[in-house]
């Protein structure tokens, strides 16, 4: 059957009538109800929230709706034990305490179960000592210590604020440096916007609002305790010695009230420079220990939070596609929260419930689309994206072969400046063409595109008249589909302007005062900005499971892969000695770019020139589309990181949020000069040319014609 | 919304002491140090010092060292500022002032100040 | 300590007409954060004083726009555009930066 055949309806107007019934009153609606309560991870009230949208998702119209669930180890405080942080004297007295919670916002005084500020999966301890100040405590924030400065953060508490990089690899590096403890706080430099008022005044993190959030480094396993595999009722797990990624050290986040009380005693050296200064009045001294009068002063943390294995539950909706149901395209996002997720992930979740109610109006009237479209309601995302990678691992086999694309729905908005996509090149003309298509929400483009706002708001760096795409990193719930799997993947939401807001993600984040109000008085009172997404999102989906050819262009791919090419060599050269002595080329590489370049530009010209009345081509060359992102993937993995298969892309090892292009070239050539076996390291960069040249070349040859 | 509020009118004999309390109310006492000021009849604002309730740590301007003592009392969210050794010229009206944290970073908030004075 | 040095002493002005005052500090207020904590407070007659400007121009909560504050490194200015009756009282200048000073005053009167 085409996929006219499959509907009563033209695909043209399957589109519009799908776009058309996305209303932003009921992501308003959906938002409300699922933000009045916490729903964290592991809890009854999320157990709940699992079962409520599992029977709305059915009357919508959705073919089935089963909820699936695994037992992972989560993190919580001590409840009758609480977390805390003290200032004590030479006499052991604590003379300061951190605060125990965040003062509720107005109107939720009342609610129980708010989880107070912790970092999940910290060990327990009571370490004291001396404090040192390590900036965001990125790489280069301990090599500026350790190297420039020669100061020793072994046997120290560092303080670390927030921002930059992902909290995990922040203290994956203070373990690295010899820390035995970490406090995390957030800086108004980074968490408060200039001439914004604090909530509940405005959308402005005050001095008592504390960010939570993992501290892992998982690199894509999962549950720590059952890597490669679904975490089920029969699952052998590892002891928590062998677990995957826990931190080693204790560690507890504060806000910037009592990180004042921290900081302004800090003495010892100097800041490096400027760009250690945050906007607190205090001296930013790095350390080690308090000046003068408080030298005898010490920091200790009491950290008694328990790791545990406890049930999580994924709603996973499928509508079945009438042409090819063996093919997927899925929109996940999560549902658990850190408190009350206004923004995350709720003002996700509802959009995914509206896209999932307008697809289900469409099935209704008698339409279906060409692909299956599952939907996933994720559990555990704030605790490692534990609820997707689990249900992944469990469906992996079923993924590889029959995975089209995947569509991210977290958070829908972190601003309300512009649109800001992240995705694989294959999907970047869907995008362009999508945006093409979409009225802007913007104020002053009206009548106007939103590919026009986009552009014109955010370009592209390389091509003039062009939005910026980003490359996928991690810290979301494509990560699996992605990293591990190879499935093409992309995610977009509404952000903030970068160049004039430099704080890092948004100042409420993870916060309790992440609430619903935060979004309707502040955010998106029309909720436009939740209706754009919602039809960007559930545009991509439609035309991922509806077009008749897969509308993947693979010569975006080819015109980034010359682009990283050209960067990782550039950096290489930054060593010219080395590259002549250890005779490190990238001809390799090149040249399987250019038979890449080549393939692909031949392919395109197939695509268009095909018969496509023939089901057995057509399906031919729509499996040449899809399986171009797994040729991507290396079985081996990563250097270190099994699950992080992607030879093209990986996240940072420096910031799991960022993707990186060539990982495992760039981290061979990372720090390479300072390499004790200098011979060593550069046979390992030769490798990993070898690799990345060999992939590219494969995945080149899956586009040549068959036979 | 946040309040202090001050103890009432104090008249002492040179030589003597007073202690001044001020009940703060409507935040949490802990975040934020409380100031000490005096204004004398028809003069400026002058600073006598400041207490960290969080901690306990105080700072004092170098006229009043030695003369001038700080204490808090976190369980009842007060502040006391006692001044020994009075003389006539510090009549004045005391204030506490709630020092703000960040943004401010200034006295964002007033005691209605407590008038001493000092008399044979 | 850092003296700050207010001009003019008094201010007689008009309603509806605008008005400035002058603070000059001894040294620089430019904290090692790049922040310059001068601030500017109101006392009415009678009252006790009250924030009006935090960090050189920032209006405190319910202060109305018709109050601005400029200046940098030592020279600082506190502008009304528009007087209103209501305005009257002692204007103070202060700075955080060191151990708290405050200047002398600026009397501000209706005509």
């Known amino acids: 059957k085409s996929s006219n055949e499959a509907t009563n309806i033209t695909p043209k107007h399957n589109m519009k009538a799908f776009l058309d019934e996305l209303k932003a009153e009921n992501i308003k609606k959906f938002l409300y109800n699922f933000t009045q309560i916490p729903h964290l991870a592991g809890t009854e009230q999320n157990f709940q929230l699992a079962k409520q949208i599992q029977s709305q998702w059915k009357e919508f119209g959705l073919d089935s709706v089963e909820l699936a669930h695994y037992d992972v180890l989560l993190s919580y405080p001590n409840k009758t034990h609480p977390n805390y942080i003290s200032i004590i004297n030479e006499d052991g007295n604590e003379i300061f305490n951190t605060s125990l919670f965040e003062p509720p916002p107005p109107g939720y005084e009342n609610v129980s179960d708010i989880v107070p500020p912790f970092s999940a999966f910290s060990p327990q301890g009571m370490p004291e000592g001396d404090l040192v100040y390590v900036n965001y405590a990125r790489t280069e924030d301990f090599f500026k210590l350790e190297r420039d400065m020669k100061i020793n953060c072994s046997g120290k508490i560092v303080i670390a604020r927030y921002g930059k990089v992902f909290r995990g690899n922040k203290v994956k590096n203070a373990q690295l440096a010899g820390a035995k403890g970490v406090i995390l706080y957030s800086d108004p430099a980074d968490y408060f916007a200039p001439g914004v008022k604090s909530y509940p005044d405005g959308w402005n993190l005050p001095g008592g609002g504390v960010q939570r959030g993992n501290i892992l480094n998982l690199n894509g396993a999962g549950d720590p305790l059952t890597p490669g595999y679904p975490a089920n009722e029969y699952a052998y797990r590892r002891g928590i010695a062998e677990a995957v990624g826990l931190p080693s050290i204790p560690v507890h986040p504060i806000g910037y009230y009592d990180a004042q009380k921290l900081l302004e005693k800090m003495g010892g050296s100097a800041p490096p420079d400027s760009s250690w200064r945050g906007s607190l009045k205090v001296p930013y001294n790095v350390g080690p220990g308090f000046t003068g009068n408080f030298s005898t002063q010490k920091v200790k943390m009491h950290i008694h939070s328990t790791n545990e294995v406890t049930r999580i539950y994924n709603v996973i909706g499928t509508l079945r596609g009438a042409v090819e149901p063996d093919r997927y395209v899925i929109l996940g996002g999560h549902r658990d929260s850190w408190v009350f997720g206004g923004i995350d992930p709720q003002s996700g979740a509802a959009v995914v419930h509206e896209i999932v109610r307008s697809f289900g109006t469409l099935k209704k009237e008698g339409w279906r689309p060409r692909r299956t479209i599952l939907f996933a309601s994720w559990d555990a995302e704030e605790f490692g994206l534990l609820g997707s990678t689990e249900w992944a691992e469990e469906n992996s086999r079923l993924l590889q072969e029959r995975g089209v694309a995947y569509i991210n729905a977290d958070s829908s908005i972190e601003g309300n400046y512009t649109l800001r996509v992240d995705c694989t090149p294959l999907m970047y003309s869907l995008v362009h063409n999508l945006t093409k298509e979409l009225k802007s929400p913007d104020e002053g483009f009206e009548g106007k595109s939103l590919y026009e706002s986009w552009t014109k708001k955010s370009p592209s760096p390389e091509f003039s008249g062009m939005p910026r795409i980003s490359k996928l990193g991690s810290g979301n719930d494509f990560e699996v589909f992605f990293q591990r799997l190879g499935i093409a993947s992309g995610r977009a939401r509404y952000t903030k302007n970068w160049e004039t807001n430099k704080f890092s993600g948004y100042p409420l984040y993870h916060s309790v005062y992440e609430t619903y109000e935060l979004v309707e008085k502040f955010y998106d009172p029309m909720f436009k900005y939740h209706l754009t997404v919602a039809q960007v999102r559930g545009g991509m989906v439609f035309e991922l499971a509806n077009s008749i050819v897969l509308p993947f262009d693979c010569r975006d791919y080819a015109v980034v892969l010359r682009k990283y090419a050209d960067k990782i060599y550039s950096i290489s050269m930054k060593h010219p000695q080395e590259m002549k002595t250890y005779s490190v080329s990238f001809d390799s590489l090149f040249s399987a770019v250019k038979n890449f370049t080549e393939i692909a530009s031949k392919f395109s010209e197939r695509l268009q020139d095909f018969d496509k009345s023939n089901p057995i081509v057509l399906r031919m060359m729509n499996d040449q589309l899809m399986f171009l992102e797994r040729a991507f993937i290396d079985p081996l993995g990563l250097p270190d990181r099994p699950f992080y298969r992607h030879v093209i892309y990986a996240p940072s090892s420096h910031n799991k949020y960022a993707g990186e292009s060539f990982p495992g070239i760039y981290d061979a050539l990372f720090d390479i000069e300072s390499k004790v076996d200098p011979s060593k390291a550069w046979g390992e960069v030769k490798r990993q040319i070898y690799v990345a040249a060999f992939t590219v070349q494969a995945a080149a040859e899956t586009l040549s014609e068959v036979a | 919304q946040v309040q202090l509020v001050q103890s009432g009118a104090e008249v002492k004999k040179p030589g003597a002491s007073v202690k001044v309390s001020c009940k703060a109310s409507?935040?949490?006492?802990?975040?934020?140090?409380i100031n000490w000021l005096r204004q004398a009849p028809g003069q400026g604002l002058e600073w006598m010092g400041g207490?960290?309730?969080?901690?306990?740590?105080?700072n004092y301007a170098q006229k009043f060292q030695g003369r001038v003592t700080l204490t808090i009392d976190t369980s009842t969210s007060t502040a006391y500022m006692e001044l020994s050794s009075l003389r006539s010229e510090d009549t004045a009206v005391y204030y506490c002032?709630?020092?703000?944290?960040?943004?401010?970073?200034?006295?964002?908030?007033w005691g209605q100040g407590t008038l001493v004075t000092v008399s044979s | 300590d850092i003296v700050m040095t207010q001009s003019p002493l008094s201010l007689p002005v008009t309603p509806g007409e605008p008005a400035s005052i002058s603070c000059r500090s001894s040294?620089?207020?430019?904290?090692?954060?790049?922040?310059?904590?001068l601030h500017w407070y109101l006392q009415k007659p009678g009252q006790s004083p009250q924030l009006l400007i935090y960090?050189?121009?920032n209006r405190f909560s319910g202060v109305p726009d018709r109050f601005s504050g400029s200046g940098s490194g030592t020279d600082f200015t506190l502008k009304i555009s528009r007087v209103e009756a209501e305005d009257v009282g002692v204007y103070y200048c202060?700075?955080?930066?060191?151990?708290?000073?405050f200047g002398g005053g600026t009397k501000v009167e209706i005509k």
């Open positions: 960090t050189v121009s």
């Open positions: 409507g935040y949490t006492f802990t975040y934020f140090d």
């Open positions: 040294q620089s207020l430019v904290h090692s954060n790049g922040q310059t904590y």
């Open positions: 002032a709630r020092d703000g944290n960040f943004p401010y970073y200034a006295m964002d908030s």
């Open positions: 207490i960290s309730p969080g901690d306990g740590n105080t």
């Open positions: 202060s700075q955080s930066t060191h151990v708290p000073t």
